[in-house]
Structures are given as C-alpha cells and as structure tokens.
Interface confidence: medium
C-alpha cells in the first residue's frame, strides 16, 4: 500500500484446487531462521476475492472480537474499522474491550483514491489460524474513511506488514509484526502464498474457498515447488528490491536497469496489478502487443479500462507472452529470474452481460512511484519475507494457475554485472506533509 498512490488491496483470490497445479518436487532443505516444514495450522488461512484483497481472521480485544483483516505488505499500520460503515458487517468496538488503551493520538492516511483516519490505541491481538500467541499491538481505530472499504470484500481492517519507516503518523508507531517478534518467540519472518482462482468467484464461492496461506514465523514446504531464490531487501521501509533485467517472451526490454526501479521497486500484497514506471510500462506493452498481434485488442484494454472476453474455455493463453523479471541475487554478480504467465497478468472478472464468456482485465498498469510487484506477481509464487536476513525469497507456488504448456518459473543463477547501479537513490528532500485542515 504505497501511501499516496493506491487503495488497499485489489488482488486476485484463490480457491480449492483450481486449474492445473504443479506436482510437489523434492528440494534440498534451506537453512532458514524460522521453523521449517509443516505449518498445518496456518495453511489455507487466507481468503479473498479477485481485485478486493486477501484477508486473514484476527481477534482484537478482551473478550476477543473477530475481524477479517487485509494482508498488506505495502504499508505498516494495523488499522481496523471502529465505527459503523455501510460496507462493514462488523467493526471493532473499543468500549467493549477491557484491555483497550487509548494513546490519545489521531492518525490520517491518504491514498490517491481514498483515505482513512482514526484514533490510535493498543489492545490484545491474536491470529486464530496463526501462531498460538497474543500480543499487545498498536491499533488505528478507523472512525472515518472515504473509498477505503470495499463493498462485498468481507474484510474490516488492514494489517500493514512493512517496516516502521512508513508507519503513520510517524516511525515511532511500532508495526504489528515488530510487536509480535518482540513479545514472543516467533521468528522474524513470514511467507505468503496467494492463490489466484483463474476465474471470477461470487460471494458464496469466496467464503467457501481458500485464498492462500500466510505462514507466520516460517516456511511451509508444501506450498511451493523447486527451490527458493532470495533477493536482498534494499532498504527496510517498503519491501524494496532491485530488478536488473526485464524480458517479454525471452526478449530483453534493453532499458537502463535504473528505469525498472525508478523510483523504487516493492513487493506489495495490497496492490492487485504489476505496476511499472511509465517508460517501462510503455516498452512492456509495446512488446506484449507485438507478441500477441494475432489478435487485436482495443487501446482501453491495455489501459486496464476495458475487458476482453472469449467464449468459455477458449481463452488463447498461448498468444500472450510470459514476462520475466530478473532480481538481484544474494551473491555478487548473480541474479535469478521469476517468470509469470498471462494466467497471472490477465485478471478474471465477471462480465454481467455475457456471463457465459471468460472475461479479463489487463493487470499491468502504469505507475509514477516505481515498480509494484502486486498480486499479479505474487499469485505465481510462494514469497518469503525473511526480515531476519533482510531478504525476500521466491519459489514457484504450488497453487498458481497455469496450463499444460507453460508454468510460472523461478530460475537461476544468471551472471549480471553492476547490479548495484540499478537501484535508484531517492533524493532526500524535506517531505512536509500536505496540509489540509481540521474541524
């Protein structure tokens, strides 16, 4: 959730075995800081709906109040609805919690298309399908919002899993995961498997289906195939990484690699699309258009505004190229690549008029704030946020949607020189907050 650019989550969601799933492969045991192997109690603990976010069940307060909370690696506040709202079935009622403590401070969080504000406090928080611990965490009780909550999304709050540097109102507000690690023996690591459905789901299907897994404190080997490849976290604010090369169907975009990371590249579960800087977006679309030129699509499709539809079951996946992002590796001059399919970057949506068709939106869009590796990317992979070692791991997800000809891939190593030069250094300006006003 980059402040100033996007509303929380617009993602895809997954269900029980949908489409083709990859078989398990054996892989060598990596040396992980967290627990290894099976986290049965946390597997399948996420639900969601295409374009509306992945959420986990959490409890807040004493006695516990159960809420569904959006999992967002692009922000750092734990914030929950705390007042009636037309789109909320339930909300956090602070007056009913004997353990709530008011911090007597307000918080205001604006995005480009929406915003929320609320009051800071602390309370006891736990994750029923997570580690068996309870922590006292900072909570922003959302009292007023505009274009933040999504009608029918089934979540009532947001769990910002990024670092304190981007917490609002300032970096002194300890994020939830920091509190969790500090107060318990949970290792400083979590991993996400977001499972795109491959087709639109209605409300009842969403509630009955699985959207993926958030493994807190470790890595579950049943959730991925092959090996995990790690890229360094460049700076601990967003989960910032460095992209060193981009290919469309194996063809290098041949841009100065700084352009790929202008002004940053982040991994953000709270954004639906793969968002690319303007120049990169234009080059990528040109290349994707050329690769898929056997069919002509309206300009509005490439802008993410128009749907394209095919008769059910006839989507021509093969005409669309694969997209590979090369990420800086852990070893000097070594990179690895992650490859996504059109099954990831064409997002299934319901077309009311022609419900017998399979309709899609182009889920790659332009950004003015750098590259955002949103759900489009993450739905192809099991992603390990190894905060302890300041790195992010990628492996092919056991639940990613593919066809009989192609699968998503994580491959390496590749020799890439001068990768440090690919990072963009944001000028340190006095970023005084936009002033608005009070009652």
């Amino acid at each position: 959730t980059q402040h100033g650019i996007r509303l929380p989550l617009r993602s895809g969601l997954g269900g029980a075995p949908l489409g083709l799933r990859l078989p398990r492969e054996t892989d060598e045991e990596p040396e992980e800081p967290g627990r290894r192997g099976s986290f049965v109690e946390m597997v399948d603990n996420l639900r969601g709906k295409s374009g509306q976010g992945y959420y986990v069940e959490m409890t807040v307060g004493s006695p516990p109040q159960t809420l569904n909370i959006l999992v967002d690696t692009g922000s750092s506040n734990f914030a929950v609805g705390a007042a009636p709202h037309p789109f909320l079935h339930r909300y956090y009622q602070r007056q009913l919690s004997s353990t709530y403590r008011d911090l007597r401070k307000g918080v205001y969080v604006p995005y480009t298309q929406g915003k929320w504000e609320g009051e800071l406090g602390t309370d006891l928080v736990s994750i029923p399908h997570g580690p068996n611990v309870t922590v006292r965490a900072n909570i922003a009780a959302i009292t007023e919002s505009d274009k933040f909550f999504i009608n029918g999304s089934n979540w009532e709050g947001i769990l910002g899993l990024a670092y304190a540097e981007i917490a609002r109102p300032d970096d002194s507000l300890e994020p939830f995961f920091d509190s969790l690690v500090k107060q318990t023996h949970v290792p400083n690591l979590f991993s996400l498997q977001l499972c795109g459905a491959g087709f639109p789901l209605n409300q009842s299907e969403v509630l009955a289906s699985v959207g993926g897994s958030m493994i807190i404190g470790g890595i579950d080997h049943s959730l991925y195939t092959g090996s995990l490849w790690y890229t360094p976290i460049r700076r601990e604010w967003y989960y910032e990484v460095i992209i060193v090369r981009v290919e469309i169907n194996g063809q290098d975009l041949k841009m100065d690699c700084k352009e790929y990371n202008y002004d940053k590249s982040i991994v953000d579960s709270g954004t639906t699309n793969l968002r690319l800087p303007k120049k990169v977006f234009e080059a990528a679309v040109k290349s994707i258009k050329a690769a898929s030129s056997t069919e002509k699509f309206p300009d509005g499709f490439w802008l993410g505004e128009q749907l394209v539809c095919w008769q059910a079951g006839t989507t021509p996946w093969n005409i669309f190229p694969v997209i590979s992002l090369y990420l800086m590796g852990e070893v000097t001059n070594q990179s690895f690549r992650i490859t996504i399919l059109p099954q990831q970057y064409l997002r299934p949506v319901e077309d009311v008029a022609t419900s017998q068709d399979d309709c899609y939106k182009f889920a790659i869009s332009q950004s003015s704030t750098g590259t955002v590796m949103g759900a489009v990317i993450m739905e192809g992979f099991y992603v390990v946020f190894d905060r302890a070692r300041k790195r992010i791991g990628f492996a092919v997800s056991a639940c990613h949607v593919h066809d009989e000809f192609r699968t998503a891939a994580v491959e390496g190593p590749f020799v890439t020189l001068d990768m440090e030069d690919c990072g963009y250094n944001i000028p340190q300006t006095d970023e005084s907050t936009l002033m608005t006003g009070r009652a």
Epitope: K105, E117, E144, P169, M435, R438
Partner: antibody
Amino acid sequence: EVQLLESGGGLVQPGGSLRLSCAASGFTFSSYAMSWVRQAPGKGLEWVSAISGSGGSTYYADSVKGRFTISRDNSKNTLYLQMNSLRAEDTAVYYCAKGGSQWLYAPGSWFDPWGQGTLVTVSS
Amino acid sequence: DIQMTQSPSSLSASVGDRVTITCRASQSISSYLNWYQQKPGKAPKLLIYAASSLQSGVPSRFSGSGSGTDFTLTISSLQPEDFATYYCDESYSTPPWTFGGGTKVEIK
C-alpha cells in the same frame, strides 16, 4: 464566500437545555469537519466538540461529555449543539468553526473560518 | 492532554515595534501548531497554520516559526490594527484540542 451563522443562544436556568444551530453556506458542507469552540466572558478559547464530515465520528471536551451532543444535517447544511444539564460555567460565547477538510486528523489542521458567535447565559 | 502555555499573557508595544509571542507545548507536537488573532467582540481569525504557513490574506509582517515544543509568532512592525489577543492551538493530538491562554497586545 464561506459563511457560518450561529443561532439559538440565550438565557437559560441551571439544569436547563438549549440547542444551538450553525447555518453554513458557500462551501460543500458535507465535505468538512466542524467544531464548536466557546469563550467565557473575559477568558480564553476552549474547544468544546467536533464532528467529522459524514457525522459518523464525534468528539467532546471532558467538561461537556455526557451533557452536550454535536450533530449535523448535511441536507440542510446545518451544524447543531444540543446542550443539556447546563451549568453556570457553561456561560460563554459559542462559535462554530469549519475545518479544512472532512478529516479531523489531517496533518497540520486548523479552525477557519469561525462564525460570529452566539451568547449562552446560564443563570438563575 | 497536551498543555499549551503562552507567554507573555499581555504586552504593551508601540506602532512599528517588533513583537514576539511564544507558545510552548507540554510535549512535542511536531509542526502542528496554529496562531489566531481575536479582536474585542469579534470571532477569532486564523493567521498562521502548521507553525509557519501564512494564511491567505494575512499581511506578511506576521510570521511563525518553531517545531517540537517551542513556537514563536512574530509581528515585524506592529500596526494599529494588530492590537488584539493572540492564541496558539495544537492539532497534533486527538481531541480534546487545547488553546494557549492567549496574549493580549495593547498600545503602550
């Protein structure tokens, strides 16, 4: 031009009630948070209550909590302050003031403009 | 609650004088401080917001500075229409918001 016009003040006995109104014009009323601020004779300014743009969130000074109720009717562009169980120490000029947005916690916030005020006298 | 302390509570000055009023917060409020001017029998008027930003229409002889706990309102050359009471107000915390006690600027 933004205008705020308070009314409803007057003389009331201790324990009595009064309802103040603030008619707003010149701006999109529902897009702005509003506050009541009072000033006892010869004294300084005291913030009394605030309400968010939608009316969904309300806040009160400890001195009036449980006795005063702030509300708004966005269809009528009007802000209200219902004052019950009035005390002598509630005697003051009551001003309504507009916020810079619908938000109460937008960084760096202020009261602007203010109405001309309405005098409330609580005396037996 | 955050307490706002203004000093002096009153001062006498002549037209053309440079006048400085200070406001101190009981804890850091970053730059979330505003200054208001109130003339007798009138409603307060916003002069400075966010510690140093001049409100539209306010003469440039008014300026604000400070951050954290200590703030200053300066009138570079006092004019006859500036004789009034000045209040500071913090907007850092959640309600209740508090004003300073006021500084009355009188003619010497």
